[in-house]
Structure formats: C-alpha cells, structure tokens
C-alpha cells in the first residue's frame, strides 16, 4: 500500500507563438482545479477507461480575474498536493491523465459552469520510494509543469511497496536473509505472512499467502521431504524424519531468482543477476520487448525481438537511462540570457523570453511596439519591457480585435439595467442605489424598499461607465 | 473572506479636517467596489461616497466639494477625506465592499467621528 503525489507546479501559456487567451475575464471569473487518473502499466487506453489506480480532484484555486491588456500570466494553483492511494502493490509502469478544468464564477443558473480546459497523457517507469520527478507536457497553446512520486505507507517499503517492516528484535543485525529497511535503519524487512503452515524452516513465498519450498521439500506446506537424494551440503541440524541434512536459512538457499537468475550472496542479503529480458529485484518482472514499448520520452527501442533476447533504448537528446525516463538537466548551464527562463523539452532547449526579449537564447532586446499593431484603433504602450494595447472605447483583448458587449456580464448590480453604449455601457440604477454599476446602496438597512433619493440624486438616473 | 478595518475617526471641531482609513485584506481593493457609509444617532444608516472597480467615484449631494474618497492599491486601502466638517457629519462611519466575483457584500465595525466645538 502507498499514496502517488502529484504537485502541480504551474499552468500556463507554453512558449512560443499563438498564446492562448486567457481562461478568465473581468466579466467572468474563474478558478482552477485539476483531476488525476493513474492506470497501471503502460496502457494505452482511452481517457475514458477505468482509473484502476485511482484517481484524485485537486481543491479549487484561487479565483482568478484577467487584467485587461496584461498578457495571460501562469494561472493561479490550488494548494497542496494531488494524492492517490494504492491499496496494492505500486506497479512500477504507470500511465497517467491530468486534466486542467476551469469552474465559472458569473451567475449561471444552477451553480457553477465547469469546463475541461487541458489534458495531458504519459506513461511512465516509477519505483516507490524514489524522489520527486518533473515533468512538462502541453496541451496546445497551454504548458503544465509538475512533480509526482510514488510512496509506501508503513510498514510497506521497496520499489513496489511489497516488502514490509517491523521493529529490529536484536539489536546488532536483522534476521538471515532479511535486510534493514532504509532509511529507517533501526527497523528490519519482515519477513512475508505465507500460507497459512507453510514451513517457516522449509519454504518461503514472495507473495503473500503463497508457499514456495525450498529445494529437497514438497507439499501444500513444504513440510514432505522430496528424497534424500535431494538434500544440499551439510549447513544445518539433521532432520528427524529422513535422516537428511537440512539446510539453515541462507539468502540464497532455494534460489529467489525466478527466471533463470543466479543468485548471489552479499553482507546484507542477496543479488540476482537476470538473464536477457528480465529484471527485477528477483527477475520477476517477465520478459520486456520492444513491442511493449519500454522506451519513454521518444526512446529508439532497437533489438529485443523475442523475450530472450534483450532491447536497447537509443534515447533522444535530453534523456537518459536504460530506457530513457531520466531527464538531463541542461538548464543548469543557464543558456537563456537577460532573465529568460529555460524550459527542457527533450528533443529540444527552448528560451521563455521576458516581455521585451527574443531570440533562441533571448539574446536581443527588442523595442516593445516594433511591429505591433493595435487594431480598431488602438494604440501601442511601451513600458517595461512589454507591450500593451490602449483600445478604443468599445474594443478589447490583447490587440483590441474583440468588439466586447459590456453588458454580457451583468455588469449592474443590485437590479440595475445594462444598456450598452458607444462609450462603454451605462447602468440604470434601481431604486435605492448608486454608484456607476449600482453597487452601493444609499440607505443599505433597506435600500429596496426606499421611495426616495437623496436631494440632488435620482438612483433611476443611468449613470455612465467609462 | 474580506476583511475590512476603519481608523482614523476622533473628535474635531466645526470647519476642521479628518482623514478615514479602511485596510482591506482578503482581497485586492483593485477588485472591489467600495464606500463609506456613515450612521447618525436615531438614524439610518446612509451612503456618503463610493468608489467603483473601475475607479469612477459617486458621492451624495451634502458632501460633494468636501469629502473626497480616494483608493491606494499598494497598501490596499481606501480612505476619505473631510474637509470643511460641520456638526450634522457627527456619525459612526463604516467602510464597505462589494467584491464583484460573488457579489456579497462586507462591512468594516465603524469608527467614530464627533463634530463638536
């Protein structure tokens, strides 16, 4: 048993050109949450199938509002961490859905509107217990960036939280065959709960409630001795029954290596050394080819035909490992130049200027309107290495292409009647309100109810909005 | 949640000045539309000046050309001016929002201004 954490870091615009527009407006705004679905192996399967990992709905973020003419900035996030649980053993290969939703917050009938804004798939090689890996996957116009790892809960330890711990019995060394549990040092591996009988001297198992026996031993429980032909060198107190010469509880007796590994003892337990496509803490892990894909991130897989014969991955630029799951840092060198910030994309490094900048490595300086046109007659504002477009009254968006209705919104409060104008919108105040969106009441213990304004103010009156 | 307090209320004699504070937290003022409402003993409780989103300003008849209210994004803050005071301005003056996103509404605990030679 374990929990899979995903930290979203940031949700975006990618770099590059045909930034998307924000999700969010002053007339409409809205927040982020974000949904998990983990699939075990490498499946393929649509995003529709079952989640048999699990899956987990982030918090709501932040409500968000755009800034008119402010360049769609990373969203902001929900806190904490997206969990899953996994009640079993943590499969290793795992693929994984991570959807970016978007819930409204105008004044829908019936509560809040959601909508999927992004989806981002993978699949991945993961051993519980490791630390946090990154990650950056698009979406379109969008760019995720997050973090996830996978964990055993207690007593459950190991790349599949398959083995358990308990507390050391002596204190210098754990039992034969068993080895500390790092990084909890003072506590020992346990050994599995088998079968029920199962021969704690003459078998063993690797799953729970089985019972595997060691050579020279038969039976359900491992308790019927094969013949005395069978028994090993002499390492261990004669046995009543057949005369034979058990052997004690050495890491390598009976051989955990499945497969074909041989086994090999060290100081602390034992290693399996596996033949051609398998691997695996006891070669477990059956026969890899290049048909099942084993190679991320764009990885060549070459070889591997048949299951006795091993693959290659011959990995992009960017990553490395057996089969390129690990990322190369090549950011660390700091490439982009006058602040830009350096996204590794494996196949390829790309800069994310700052306003004001371009070029591969964001190495020259530009003047901010230089070829930039606002339309509708707009007008372009310099300032701070960035650029920004001064629309007429009427138009809107980044370069004033979008003819807004002021009044789509509701923008009157209070009851107030929107009436778009070719100055903006004016809002006719009910009764009993004020303001250029009719947002104060002028006696608020009973605003509706008023037969009056106060000398001098009509609240009937449209007030204009500039 | 927003949170509103109001300072700067006292005791000030006829023609005197006084300036109101009102710190906002849970919110930007830059998204809200705010005002100060103020409340006479033995009376209601009424609208004195406003300041929407979009910075536009209203103001009631009895006290345009004396107060002015005014809005500091950086300190998150909304203030208002009295100049020329007068014994009838003498009320528990209170700071208000309306935060555009939910449209709900919140109110500060008032502070206290006494007009008074």
């Known amino acids: 048993a374990g929990v899979f954490e995903l930290q979203i870091h940031s949700f975006g615009p990618g770099p590059g050109p045909g930034a998307p527009r924000s999700p969010c407006s002053a007339r409409l705004p809205c927040r982020l949450f974000f949904r998990v679905c983990l699939k075990p192996g490498l499946s393929e399967e649509a995003a529709e199938s079952p989640c048999a990992l699990g899956a987990a709905l982030s918090a709501r973020g932040p409500v968000y509002t755009e800034q008119p003419g402010a360049p769609a900035p990373d969203l902001p996030l929900p806190d904490g961490l997206l969990q899953v649980p996994f009640r079993d053993a943590w499969p290793g290969t795992f693929s994984f859905i991570i959807e970016t939703w978007r819930e409204e917050l105008g004044d829908q009938i019936g509560g809040p509107a959601w909508s999927l804004l992004a989806r981002v798939a993978g699949r991945r090689r993961l051993a519980a217990g490791g630390p946090w890996a990154r990650d950056i996957q698009r979406a379109g116009a969008w760019e995720l960036r997050f973090s996830y790892r996978a964990r055993c809960e207690p007593p459950a330890v190991g790349t599949a939280c398959t083995r358990l711990c308990r507390p050391r019995s002596a204190p210098s060394r754990c039992g034969p065959g068993l080895r500390p549990c790092a990084p909890l040092e003072d506590e020992c591996e346990a050994p599995l709960v088998c079968r029920a009988g199962c021969s704690p001297e003459h078998g063993f198992c690797e799953q729970p409630g089985e019972c595997r026996c060691l050579e020279g031993w038969t039976g359900p429980l491992c308790t019927v001795p094969v013949s005395t032909s069978s028994c090993l060198s002499p390492r261990g107190p004669s046995s009543a029954t057949t005369g034979c010469l058990v052997p004690g509880p050495g890491p390598c007796d009976g051989n955990p290596c499945a497969n074909g590994g041989s086994c090999s003892e060290t100081p602390r337990s034992f290693e399996c050394t596996c033949p051609r496509g398998f691997y695996g803490l006891r070669c477990e892990v059956s026969g890899v080819t290049c048909a099942d894909g084993p190679c991320f991130n764009g990885g060549l897989c070459v070889g591997g035909a048949d299951p006795d014969s091993a693959y290659i991955c011959h990995c992009p630029p960017g990553f490395q490992g057996s089969n390129c799951e690990k990322r190369v840092d090549r950011c660390s060198l700091q490439p982009c130049r006058n602040g830009g910030l350096c996204l590794d994309l494996g196949h390829a490094l790309r800069c994310r200027c700052r306003a004001g900048f371009a070029g591969p490595r964001c190495e020259h300086d530009l003047d901010d309107c230089a070829g930039r046109a606002c339309a509708n007659g707009g007008t372009c504002v310099e300032g701070g290495g960035a650029h920004r477009c001064s629309c007429a009254l009427g138009f809107g968006g980044r370069d004033c292409r979008e003819r807004a209705d002021p009044c789509a919104a509701r923008p009157c409060a209070h009851g107030g009647r929107c009436y778009a104008h070719f100055s903006g919108l004016v809002c006719a105040c009910a009764p009993g309100y004020m303001g250029a969106r009719c947002e104060f009441p002028v006696h608020p213990d009973g605003a509706s109810a008023l037969p009056a304004a106060p000398p001098g103010l009509r609240p009937g009156d449209p007030q204009r909005y500039l | 949640e927003v949170q509103l307090v109001e300072s700067g209320g006292g005791l000030v004699q006829p023609g005197g000045s006084l300036t109101l504070s009102c710190a906002a937290s849970?919110?930007?003022?830059?998204?809200?539309?705010m005002a100060w409402y103020r409340q006479a003993p033995g009376k209601k409780r009424e609208l004195v000046a406003g300041?929407?989103?979009?910075?536009?300003?209203a103001y009631i008849d009895s006290v345009k050309g004396r107060f002015t209210i005014s809005r500091d994004n950086a300190k998150n803050s909304v203030y208002l001016q009295m100049n020329s005071l007068r014994a009838e301005d003498t009320a528990v003056y209170y700071c208000?929002?309306?935060?555009?996103?939910?449209?709900?509404?919140?109110w500060g605990q008032g502070t206290l201004v006494t007009v008074s030679s």
């Open positions: 849970g919110s930007s003022v830059s998204f809200l539309s």
């Open positions: 300041i929407s989103a979009d910075g536009s300003t």
């Open positions: 208000y929002a309306y935060r555009w996103t939910t449209r709900r509404t919140y």
